[in-house]
Every structure is written in C-alpha cells, then in structure tokens.
Interface confidence: medium
C-alpha cells in the first residue's frame, strides 16, 4: 500500500520528503506482536500505557495492570508470572551492550494490589525471569545467579563465583552475547521449571580493550572490556543445571562437552530443552565448520546429565562454514527425540530437514532452488515456516505451513495472496499450539499486524494498519522503487534502486551505492521504509541502489560461502561490477557517482572507493572495520580462518583498508567513527586515518565522542546532516 | 450431536433486507472457536459462501457481497444471523448455515449444515 | 479468489460403472481439496477431504486423488443412490470456493 500515484494536476499539493521529516521519524511505522500467554489470549500495552489481557474466543478484554501502577515506579517493561499471580515491573533501564543492560525491579501482586515487600530484589539486577510455569524467579545479580521460589522468599544463591569481566554466570560476555548468542540471557528453564541450566563464561585470559570515556568529569572514565580479538584468547564456557526443587540438594551439575568437541578450543552455540528431564546443546569448534548437537538426559540415580554419542548429529560445511550467520537451532517434535532443523541440502540451499536418528538419515522436508529461513512452530499436525520460494524474489518472506500429522502431505503459502502488492515480507508470532497467530507485514507496502486463526489461517482483525502513516504519506513524492536482478557470470545480483519521484528514463542522475555486504547478510528486501535514502531521492534527485552481492544471503551457498576465508574481494567486485551495469542504463551521470556503508559496509565502501577504478567521485565510511585482526574471534574466524602463518594471516594482512591509503587519493573520503564503539572498535578509523597522514592522502572524517557503534540520539542528526553536505558538495548540488 | 437450523421470510422484496437466523443445538456455540458460516445456492446453480463468523465477533464476508452482508451473533440465544442488504432477484437462493470441522494442517470442510431455507426476491 | 472448475457439468452413466469428475483450481491448492455429494432438496455431505481421505461412513468406492491444481473424484462402481449432484471445494485461501458441480444421471 504505497500511496498512489497522482497525476500531474494533483503534483503541486505534494511535496517532497525533507531530512527533518527523517529526523524527526515522522514517518516511522508500528507493528504489532501479541505478547501470548495462552493458546488464545495475550496481553498488550494500549496506547494510554495499561496493560491489557484480550482473549479472543470470547472477544473479551480486561486490564490487569494500571497505567497508574506502571507510573508509580517508572515502569518502561513488564511481564507476567504463568500463574498470574505476579507482575514484575522495570524500571531504570540502562543500557549496556546490544542487547544487554541492567534495571531495578518491583515484582507486584496482582491478588491483592500492592508491591511485594520483603525480600525484594537487589539493584541493578543484569537479567531476571519467570519460571515457565508457576512464579518462580531467577535473577543475575553482579554476574551470579540467584533463584526464588515465591517474590517474597529469600534468595538461593546458585553461584558464588561470578566477578565482573571475568567470571559470567547467566548472562554472556562481549563476544558471546554479539557474536554467538544474540541475547542478554545465559540461562534457560526447562518447560515445567524443574530445572534451570546456565553458561558459566571465564573471561579470565581473555585480553581487554580499553577506551576513554570523555563524560563531563576532570579525567575521562577508561572502559575495559574483555574482547577476544580474531586470533586471541576465547572465553571458556561451561554449561550446569541445577534442579530448581532441592537447588541446596545437589547444586549444579556440569553437562559434559562431546569428546570431539573438547579435543580444540570450541564454542557453545545455543540450548534447548527438550523436556524437564532432557535437553539439547550445541557446540562449535573454533573453526566454524564443525557443529555438534548433542542431546542429554537426566539420569535420576545419579543426579546426573548423561550425553550418549547415539545422541550426538554432526553437522560439517566442506565448502565455508556450519550454518548461515548462526548455527541453526533445532525444532523437537512432540515424541521428544526427533527434530526439525534448517540446513544445507546436497545442492546447496538452506532447508528444512526432519532427523530421527541421525543426520545421514534426514528426511527433507522442503526443497528447490531457494531458501527455507526460520521455522515458527511444530504442532502435532503442522509444520510453520518462513521462506523466499514465492516468485523466486530471495528478497521476500512468506509464511508456509507443512502438514506432518495427515497424507499426504500438503504445503500451503498463508501469506503469498493475502494483501499480495502490500505485503511480500512476513514474520510471525504464534499462540501456544498454533491455536492463533499473529502476521507482521513489513511491506513493501505501508505496513500492517493481522491476527489469524491457527486451524484456517483466515484473517479474523486487523491489529495495526498504519493508518495516521497511510494518511501522513498521502501528500508526499515518495521515490519510486524497483527490485530487478543482473545476471553476470553466472552470478545473480540482486539489487534495489530507488529514484525520483518524477524519475525520467532519458535524463542523466547522481547515484549513491548503499552497502552492507557482509556474509550472510541481506540488503535487497522487500520492506517499507522512509529513510535518509528516500529523501536523498525524494528531495535531492539521486538514485539510490543496493545490491546483493556474493557473501549475502538466502540464495543458495554457492553465493554465501564465496567469501570464505577471503573477505573484502567479491563483495566490492561485486558492487563494482553492479555500478558499471547501472551506467550501461543510460540515465546515470558517470561523473557523479557516490558509494557509503555502515560498518561492515563501512569496510566494503572503503575497499570499493580504493579500488583504483575511477568510477567513484566520493564516499562516506561509518565505523568502518579496517583490518579483520582487529575484530572479534567469533565472527572473523567464522569466515577468515585465524590469523597465523599456517592458517589464513596473509589474506588478513592483503585486506585491510590501511595497505590501500595510496588509492584514496583520488577520492572525496569521509571517515566517521564514534570514539566509544565497543563493537568495531575506534582504533580501526585511527589506523586508517594514521594510514592516510603517512602517504600524504588528503581526506575528511568526523568522530562522535562518547557514541558507539549505533551512534544514537543528537549525534544521529549531526552524522546525516553532515553526510548529506558531504554528498550535496560531491554531487554539485545546491544547499 | 450438532444440529443447525435457519429461519427466516421466505420472501423479500427487492431492494429490502433479507434477514435469516441460524439457531445451534446440541452444542454451546461459544464453546469453541469455530467459525459460522453462511452459503448459498441460487437454484440449479452451485455453492457460493457469503460470509463467516467467529463467537467473538470476528467476522469475514466474501469479498463479491462484502458491502452488502452483516453477520452478527447472539451467544446467549445460541444464534447467529446474516443481514444482506439491497436484495435483488440474483439474491434468489437456498440459504444454508453451516459449520466447519478442522483437520490435518490448516485445512478444513463444512461438517455440518443447516437443512437450507428458500429465499425468494420478488415484488 | 481461487476459481474452480469442474467437468463435465453433467454425466449419463449406469449402475456399476467407473465415474471419474475432474476439479481444476486457478492456483496451486496443495492437497486443500474436498468433494461434496448433493441431492435434490438436501444440504450438501462430506465424502473427500484433503483431497484423497475418505469421510468416515463414506462407502470406500468412492475415492479422491491429485494436488496442485488437478483433482479428480472417482466412483468405482455407480449404485443407485450415488446419483447426485458432486461439488469441489477449496480450503486453501479466503474465501472457500466451490466448483459449479457435476451431475450423474442415470443413462
């Protein structure tokens, strides 16, 4: 649903997006994710800031929390006990890395209206949650791991050893929380919260970054983080669980590591509970290719977890990594031993596979020349799952269901003709046993929540349509935008391009590369945005396009692992390659060509605009990686191998952007990093900057104090604003 | 065992309101979330359905008669009704009301029927 | 709206004979299919769902097979009461929808 187009008698009352409209999210969207509680009722936060519990079946709606409540304690979040008897309330949020931060909590009692006293908890707490059935809390506090049998109960402390940046009981360090876990949590209850298993994390060996913190003090603050650069000392992980009945009876028990993963330095991957009584872990070794899944059981004469081989499956890339960005996660049946699971299938495509006994014996489940993405949910009856096969667009998502529990068996798309011009691009959030489900379009349309039945998959209401946004947008030119493909030595180069409003064929625009380009990683999607691009378009005349080069994603590993163990060559050939096409098309001024990226992308516009081709004017890198042995073990090593003699160190050394100052001489460079990036660290603009002074390049930058790698709030405003002069400038445009 | 039955005017003039009504026994019709339908067959011709509705309120009509149909329900009569506006003699048909049973992935057929009741349009 | 399309519209057949009706979909359905049996002055009846499962109490002579966008309703062995009227209908997408149905008369 993009406002349609008007005619030309209708064009003077519309108007073009402005770079306030941008800063100012005027046209930002909602979206609309149930938080479920049961196979048909979930709780929502109206729009006056009550928390409201809507049951479906029969319509009604009641509100179990105050806005009045929430207000007393500066509550931000909430979440409700399974035996809804208590509500725990946050409240002084803080934030600390992507996911992670801390906050107090008020643990309220919804029977008879009045907080908890007694016992209440300590603050900052780093991580607290419910047990899945029952109230039952278990909390991180100054990284040990503390558990209640009721709110008001005094603790049990079930680690003792915790200290901060070197032992992490429950909650990930650094790398493992960005680059392994994607969470802020390290700890996971069993289904009926008998047991709870955690990661312990040793960081101890681990070698720190250390940065300054300007503040407003006499002395800038040092922040010391252990960071286990590619090549370095990792963190040792230890997987316990303790039985949450009798914590005091036993205490935790270790899960042994499978032998062929203890033999090297490893990772833990993820954990899955299974039953009360078994669960799934997975493992990694240091050299990304090798994951195991490794399914344990409770051994009650022991008081034990036992780990049988028979219960091991080994997952092996021969040709790049295991997985896509992460090892896939496992989806265990209802007879608790056979699974579902995504990965690679003998031609190289990402799918569903079901393994019952061993991965050798995998049925597969979905097949063909695209990919299956993520998988919602298995019921008895019917598989949920995500994919790209409609239309053969990778760069959209619909919602299929697999029956498993009749024959034969039936495939159906639930979303492919829904609102099919609005919405090409899906996620979704289910009800327990799929009773009810909640579809998220993305777009490309204007976005929009719709709730559905779980056995007939209609539409039964619409939870959020966007209709101030449809109605804001209704006045403006928006660009125009088309997702085409450019077929080029048998490699598919998918791409977005996004153009003026009133875009003619046979006038000649300025044209700005947008890259990210890292492996596994998707740009071309068909999703709703209005973003500093589209004003670029909208308002500035430039052509704008995306590609999806070799590394990126959901195209099948042929084009995924072509970057293996040699980041920073295809990537920027690729976007090279895609420009000179783009001036094949006749309306791009050649002499007026732009490249910038963020990150990873920061990385690849560097290379691109050092790559002695001539085709870009200028460019803009913000907080680019510069050298691959300054980021992180985790996710280098994935695609990069090590940085040692006998292992990779040479590619590490010929792909940094600093061995190509030389080339940026004959570019308008704009480098850009916040000085308190945690994640790719200051130091990588610094070397590059220093590389630049010592060949003599001239070239412009702009550091955020204090900021990091997301570059938030007034320094958001400042970095567009500037880049936008920076383009303006380069493309000979007036202000 | 469940058992639905329509009622209505078997004649409406053109331009009018057909109402009819579908009473449920044999079973709660709030208890579960099954949805109620309304199908139709004008005479010698095929099934068309017009509309459903869930005991919440929920409703989804066909998008060829959507401007023209409500379905509402009754959950203390054990009821639910169709309205359809602006009647023609196209709308001349046997109305039935109906009710699924689901099966298998998603998938799902009319279990139960109404015995159907004639409406005629004409002045 | 996924259209459907039955043939023939109507059929002449006897006692004992082999009858096959075919139901096309204007999209792929998967194996979201089901027939109906009709007869004069009755509400329709359940004999085929997911395109090949036999209702229960369905006697088994009447079979159902295909996906995709091909079905077809098979009747072994044509008994007196088994001339009706036979509807397909797809459960795949909203709105269901029902082909225009099939007659067996008797020749």
């Known amino acids: 649903l993009r406002p349609s187009r008007v005619h030309n008698s209708e064009e003077n009352t519309m108007r073009a997006l402005t770079l306030k409209d941008i800063l100012n999210g005027t046209f930002s969207y909602k979206t609309f994710f149930p938080n479920w509680i049961s196979g048909q009722e979930y709780l929502h936060q109206s729009a006056d800031n009550n928390i409201v519990l809507y049951n479906i079946e029969t319509g009604q709606s009641y509100t179990i929390l105050s806005n009045r409540t929430m207000k007393s304690v500066n509550a931000s979040n909430y979440g409700l006990s399974p035996d809804r008897q208590f509500v725990y309330l946050e409240s002084d949020y803080s934030k600390l890395w992507r996911y992670s931060y801390t906050a107090t909590y008020y643990i309220y009692d919804l029977s008879n209206g009045e907080f908890v006293r007694g016992n209440e908890l300590p603050r900052p707490i780093q991580y607290l949650c419910w047990s899945p059935v029952g109230s039952k809390l278990a909390y991180v506090y100054q990284n040990n791991i503390y558990l209640k049998q009721r709110p008001g109960d005094p603790p049990f402390q079930i680690t003792f050893n915790g200290r901060e940046n070197k032992i992490f009981n429950g909650i990930p360090d650094w790398v493992y929380e960005e680059e392994m876990l994607a969470t802020k949590y390290a700890l996971w209850w069993s289904p009926n919260g008998k047991f709870l298993a955690y990661a312990e994390f040793n960081d101890t060996d681990i070698p720190v970054i250390a940065y300054s913190y300007y503040g407003d003090e006499q002395y800038p603050r040092t922040i010391n983080i252990p960071y286990p650069k590619a090549g370095a000392k990792n963190p040792v992980v230890r997987i316990f669980i303790i039985d949450t009945t009798y914590p005091a009876y036993v205490g935790p028990q270790e899960v042994p590591v499978p032998a062929m993963i203890a033999s090297s330095d490893y990772y833990f991957s993820w954990l899955t509970w299974v039953t009360d009584e078994r669960v799934c872990l997975q493992w990694l070794k240091r050299v990304q290719n090798v994951s195991v899944l490794s399914i344990c059981d409770f051994r009650e004469d022991w008081q034990t977890w036992d780990c049988p081989k028979t219960q091991e499956h080994i997952e092996e890339s021969r040709t790049g990594w295991a997985g896509g960005f992460f090892v896939s996660t496992p989806v265990f049946s209802y007879d608790a031993i056979s699974y579902y699971k995504i990965f690679s299938d003998k031609d190289g495509y990402k799918h569903i596979h079901y393994i019952k006994d061993t991965v050798e014996n995998a049925i597969q489940i979905t097949s063909g020349k695209w990919e299956a993405i993520n998988i919602f949910r298995v019921t008895q009856d019917s598989l949920f799952y995500s994919s790209n096969e409609f239309e053969e667009y990778p760069g959209r998502r619909n919602i299929y269901r697999i029956s498993i529990g009749s024959y034969p068996p039936s495939k159906k798309c639930v979303t492919c003709h829904l609102r099919k011009e609005r919405c090409q691009y899906y996620t979704a959030s289910f009800s327990d046993y799929a009773k009810y489900y909640a579809l998220v379009c993305y777009g490309p349309g204007i976005p929009i929540s719709t709730l559905h039945d779980g056995r007939t998959d209609q539409e039964i209401k619409i939870l959020e349509e966007n209709k101030e946004l449809e109605n804001a947008l209704k006045n403006i030119q928006l660009p125009k935008e088309e997702i085409k493909k450019l077929e080029v030595d048998e490699i598919t180069l998918w791409y977005k391009m996004i153009l003026p409003p009133q875009f003619d064929r046979s006038k000649k625009y300025p044209l700005l590369i947008q890259v990210y380009g890292g492996p596994c990683s998707q740009s071309v999607r068909s999703v709703f945005a209005v973003n500093w691009i589209s004003y670029l378009a909208s308002k500035e005349g430039m052509v704008i396009a995306l590609v999806d080069g070799r590394g990126t994603a959901f195209q099948g590993d042929k084009l995924l692992y072509a970057v293996y163990r040699k980041l920073g060559v295809y990537e920027v050939e690729d976007q090279i390659t895609a420009v000179r096409k783009f001036i094949e098309m006749g309306f791009i001024d050649e002499k007026r060509i732009a490249i910038w990226g963020w990150s990873y992308g920061g990385y690849v516009s560097s290379l691109a605009l050092a790559s002695g081709t001539g085709l870009f004017k200028c460019g803009i890198a913000v907080a680019p990686v510069s050298s691959w042995e300054y980021y992180a073990s985790v996710y280098t090593e994935r695609f990069m191998g090590l940085p040692t003699k006998d292992d990779n160190l040479e590619h590490y050394k010929n792909s940094t952007v600093m061995a190509r100052a030389e080339y940026f001489r004959n570019v308008d460079y704009l480098l850009i990093h916040g000085t308190a990036d945690d994640n790719v660290h200051f130091q990588n603009s610094a070397q590059i900057a220093k590389a630049l002074v010592n060949a003599q390049v001239d070239f412009q930058a702009m550091w955020y104090s204090d900021q990091n790698h997301g570059l938030s709030g007034l320094s958001t405003n400042h970095l567009y604003t500037h880049m936008t002069h920076f383009l303006k400038q380069c493309f000979s445009l007036s202000d | 065992q469940l058992q639905l039955q329509e009622s209505g005017p078997g004649l409406v003039k053109p331009s009018e309101t057909l109402s009819l009504t579908c009473t449920v026994s044999?079973?709660?019709?709030?208890?579960?979330?099954?949805?109620w339908a309304w199908i139709r067959q004008p005479p010698g011709k095929g099934l068309e359905f017009i509309g459903n509705i869930y005991y919440s309120g929920s409703t989804y009509y066909n998008p060829s008669l959507k401007s023209r149909v409500t379905i509402s329900v009754d959950t203390s009569k054990n009821q639910f009704s169709l309205k359809l506006s602006s009647v023609t003699a196209a709308d001349t048909a046997v109305y039935y009301c109906?009710?699924?049973?689901?099966?298998?992935?998603?998938?799902?057929?009319?279990?139960?029927w109404g015995q159907g009741t004639l409406v005629t349009v004409s002045s | 709206d996924i259209q459907m399309t039955q043939s023939p519209s109507s059929l002449s057949a006897s006692v004992g004979d082999r009858v096959t009706i075919t139901c096309r979909a204007s999209?792929?359905?998967?194996?979201?299919l089901n027939w109906y049996q009709q007869k004069p002055g009755k509400a329709p009846k359940l004999l085929i769902y997911a395109a090949s499962s036999l209702q229960s109490g369905v006697p088994s002579r009447f079979s159902g097979s295909g996906s995709g966008t091909d079905f077809t309703l098979t009747i072994s062995s044509l008994q007196p009461e088994d001339f009706a009227t036979y509807y397909c209908?797809?459960?795949?997408?909203?709105?269901?929808?029902f082909g225009q149905g099939t007659k067996v008369e008797i020749k």
């Open positions: 209908q797809q459960s795949y997408s909203t709105p269901p929808t």
């Open positions: 109906a009710r699924p049973s689901y099966y298998g992935s998603g998938n799902y057929y009319f279990a139960f």
């Open positions: 044999g079973g709660s019709i709030s208890s579960s979330s099954y949805f």
């Open positions: 999209q792929s359905i998967s194996s979201y």
